[in-house]
């Protein structure tokens, strides 16, 4: 959480953001609040990216001023123009690029002052794994597939009979570029598994964590997934 | 005034490809996305990807991945979609649709004429 | 992915008020949809008539609207006109594709 304060002049406003991680090709959110004021007309919301000439985007007097935006941003930037006069300046953004990664100001003047707030933007690729039995091969084996992930990730399994124990030399991962030439569809297979357990497959790198879990019995199989970003700090 | 204006009909043979164009007059073309649209009868609008002409940016449904690409050339303010590998699943009517992102405006507002394919042996 | 559902078919009368609705398998409709509603009227005529839920594209007449009605998108046409009769689409966004509605077929009587 990074909290940022005004210049000098007009008082000081508290503007707060929260470092996020965008997902490339789909849509994204970079988080910026700040105290309201009571006129939408007296709100300014500015935001910019470190080394980038032009504005990402601004939205003043109740509507988008992009006469001064990058090139970069045109077309995929909106803030939640409903939400602004309650002190939401987040920005959306639209078909999130690799090349989007960065720091990010979020800029703020209001009637009661002004105010900013500093935001770090990763971007990769990540997906939710799915865990099958595969039928086709000759011993009980598990495959792991995830469609989506950048960089490049790591993939580790576990049980939860065989707690500790270490699956690399019974697993086999393979990562395939996917017709992008950037994002990777992760497939590992795991070997000679037992029945009445439950395994585990995480996929992480430095943007995201996500777990495949499969619980497979005599008389039926159980999956459960979830993923979660990393490094969700605000400031 | 806003205007999309696309290539005319299309008679192909299966196996081909073709390129349909779409050419935007009235507005700034390169801040505007350009959303591709298939018509079937029977099975209503399927949207094919869209593209951002200013940067290139592009995004496909999954479905259409291997079928279309999008170009556009921002001299001449035309989008283009090619489909390779034609049969006859892909005889429909083809639409390009201007998007407007922004705060306080998304929205469709304006579709071309439409461009007719037929694939046929 | 989603499948978007919308009535086959309604009827109404000229100056009447009718609501067209637009339901996602996914569950309820939200801002981030950013529903859009189009027309289609005879030999491919299309025109953007809603975005964004509750976005009117300048040109589009006043009786047209857009809200969020429960956990569907909807379209309202307050004093229905008889050259309303089309078929009505909706779309919704998915984070990083679009998905339509099978189309309402508005009859005017």
């Known amino acids: 959480l990074i909290i940022g304060f005004g210049i000098s002049g007009r008082h000081s406003i508290t503007v707060t953001t929260v470092a996020s991680a965008g997902n490339i090709g789909e849509d994204g959110i970079l988080s910026c609040t700040f105290e309201p004021d009571i006129k939408l007309s007296d709100i300014v919301i500015q935001w910019l990216k470190e080394g980038v000439l032009g504005l990402v985007h601004e939205f003043k007097e109740g509507k988008d001023e992009l006469s001064e935006q990058d090139e970069m941003f045109r077309g995929r930037t909106a803030v939640f123009a409903d939400q602004v006069i309650v002190g939401n300046a987040s920005l959306r953004l639209k078909n999130v690029q690799l090349t989007d990664a960065g720091t990010y100001k979020c800029y703020i003047i209001t009637s009661k002052g002004k105010g900013n707030a500093n935001l770090e933007y990763k971007t990769g690729a990540f997906s939710m794994p799915e865990v099958n039995v595969d039928y086709n091969a000759s011993s009980e084996t598990l495959r792991c597939e995830a469609p989506r992930w950048f960089p490049q990730p790591t993939v580790v399994w576990a049980s939860q009979v065989d707690q500790g124990a270490n699956f690399s030399e019974v697993s086999n991962t393979s990562f395939e570029l996917n017709s992008e030439n950037v994002t990777m569809k992760v497939v590992s297979v795991l070997y000679n598994v037992t029945i009445n357990n439950t395994y585990s497959c995480m996929i992480e790198n430095d943007i995201a964590k996500a777990t495949g879990d499969i619980k497979v019995t005599e008389s039926e199989i159980k999956r459960r997934s979830h993923l979660q970003l990393l490094n969700s700090k605000a400031s | 005034q806003v205007q999309l204006q696309q290539s005319g009909a299309e008679l192909m043979k299966p196996g081909a490809s073709v390129k349909i164009s779409c050419k935007a007059t009235g507005y700034t073309f390169s801040s505007y996305w350009i959303e591709w649209v298939k018509q079937r009868p029977g099975h209503g609008l399927e949207w094919i990807g869209e593209?951002?002409?200013?940067?290139?940016?592009?995004k496909y449904n999954e479905k259409f991945k291997t079928k279309a690409t999008f170009t556009a050339d921002t001299s001449s303010n035309t989008a283009y979609m090619q489909l390779s590998s034609l049969t006859s699943e892909d005889s429909a009517v083809y639409y390009c649709a201007r998007y407007y992102f922004g705060s306080v405006n998304f929205y469709f507002d304006c579709w071309g004429q439409g461009t007719t394919l037929t694939v046929s042996s | 992915q989603a499948v978007v559902t919308q009535e086959s078919a309604l009827t109404t009368s000229p100056g009447e008020t009718v609501t067209l609705t637009c339901r996602s398998s996914?569950?309820?409709?939200?801002?981030?949809?950013?529903a859009n509603w189009v027309q289609e009227k005879p030999d491919h005529l299309f025109t953007g008539l809603i975005g964004?839920?509750?976005n009117r594209p300048p040109g589009v007449p006043a009786r047209f609207s857009g809200s969020l009605i429960g956990d569907k998108a909807a379209l309202t046409i307050t004093g229905t006109q008889t050259e309303d009769e089309a078929i009505y689409f909706c779309?919704?966004?998915?984070?990083?594709?679009?998905?339509f509605g099978g189309g309402t077929k508005l009859t005017v009587l």
């Open positions: 964004g839920t509750d």
């Open positions: 779309a919704l966004w998915y984070s990083n594709h679009w998905v």
């Open positions: 996914t569950g309820a409709v939200t801002t981030s949809n950013y």
């Open positions: 593209i951002l002409p200013g940067s290139g940016i592009t």
